[in-house]
Amino acid sequence: RAVPGGSSPAWTQCQQLSQKLCTLAWSAHPLVGHMDLREEGDEETTNDVPHIQCGDGCDPQGLRDNSQFCLQRIHQGLIFYEKLLGSDIFTGEPSLLPDSPVGQLHASLLGLSQLLQPEGHHWETQQIPSLSPSQPWQRLLLRFKILRSLQAFVAVAARVFAHGAATLSP
């Protein structure tokens, strides 16, 4: 594990995997299905979707003082998106295109979350509703919206790990 007993993570490993996540999130976005992009408007996601915010300790000072606050927040987000990508939203009709990187993205989210999960320590994770949207048009649009939210999330996470790898690695 990268965070044995709650000490520092393997920053370089996390940096590499988070950069891969960024690439996959951007490449997955246009490949989740054919749709009319007019719905790709300017609506904001709400606070129910994990964001990395000022009070989460992900700034350089916060990471220096105690990186656990920030890492827990990132871990919660990774689990949130990992569950969504494994849900019926992505597995139900309409089927993903054969060359969609969503499967790889799902596996990489799980991989990074495992790197961050301390041995014998279980961070609280956000509850994901167990019931799926029932209509294909809903799933198709939600895929775009979820991936767009995920892009923003992993971009911030990647910056955190890049900073950690550059300044906090042993």
């Epitope: 719905e39 996601t45 709400t46 129910d48 509703p129 294909p136 048009w137």
Partner: antibody
Framework: EVQLLESGGGLVQPGGSLRLSCAAS????????MEWVRQAPGKGLEWVSY????????IYADSVKGRFTISRDNSKNTLYLQMNSLRAEDTAVYYC??????????????WGQGTMVTVSS | DIQMTQSPGTLSASVGDRVTITCRAS??????LAWYQQKPGKAPKLLIY???SLESGVPSRFSGSGSGTEFTLSITSLQPEDSASYFC?????????FGQGTKVEIK
């Protein structure tokens, strides 16, 4: 008993605002995706807006986008529709509806009784 | 948007008759079609989902069939309480759209 109960309708002038509420009971509201559907007097049904079960993502019909905002408070088992910049063509009975909670269905299984919104000067 | 066209607009039939309503989609929607019944001043009630699945509690005289672009709702033995408007709805593509409705009257 599974139930949806809308409120907040009324008469409003063009350009005005209204906030509709839909109180849910008899089911675990936070697990369900919800919608608003409207019906102009003597006309057919028109889908208006959708919100994901956690409230994280919303979708709107082109006719209301930028003017209406759907939201929910899962702790209060309530769905909302904030309607701004109302127009005469928004005059309708507004229904909240629940999605069937299975990916192989594709329909609205529970509807409220509706609340009438009249936009007129 | 996918256009849903119902026919006939109105139909009048006697108690015990078999009644059929047709719904046509402007493009293929696979089997993603639902049928609703609406009585005056009331909310719509789901009858059929996924083209042919009967909603729980709906009498077995109601049935749905079809796929692609052409769908039918049948009532095998019309009852007085079936006097209502019937709407089809496609759930395949954004935005979800409804047919204009068919009014069923009892002679």
């Amino acid at each position: 008993e599974v139930q949806l109960l809308e409120s907040g309708g009324g008469l409003v002038q063009p350009g005005g605002s209204l906030r509709l509420s839909c109180a849910a009971s008899g089911f675990t509201f936070s697990h369900y995706t919800m919608e608003w559907v409207r019906q102009a007097p003597g006309k057919g049904l028109e889908w208006v807006s959708y919100i994901y079960s956690s409230g994280g993502w919303t979708i709107y019909a082109d006719s209301v986008k930028g003017r209406f905002t759907i939201s929910r408070d899962n702790s209060k088992n309530t769905l909302y529709l904030q309607m701004n910049s109302l127009r005469a063509e928004d005059t309708a009975v507004y229904y909240c509806a629940r999605d069937i909670p299975t990916s192989s269905a594709g329909a609205f299984d529970i509807w409220g009784q509706g609340t009438m919104v009249t936009v007129s000067s | 948007d996918i256009q849903m066209t119902q026919s006939p607009g109105t139909l009048s039939a006697s108690v015990g008759d078999r009644v059929t309503i047709t719904c046509r989609a402007s493009q293929s929607i696979s089997s993603w079609l639902a049928w609703y019944q609406q009585k005056p001043g009331k909310a719509p009630k789901l009858l059929i989902y996924k083209a042919s699945s009967l909603e729980s509690g709906v009498p077995s005289r109601f049935s749905g069939s079809g796929s692609g672009t052409e769908f039918t709702l049948s009532i095998t033995s019309l009852q007085p309480e079936d006097s209502a408007s019937y709407f089809c709805q496609q759930a395949n593509s954004f935005p979800p759209t409804f047919g204009q409705g068919t009014k069923v009257e009892i002679k």
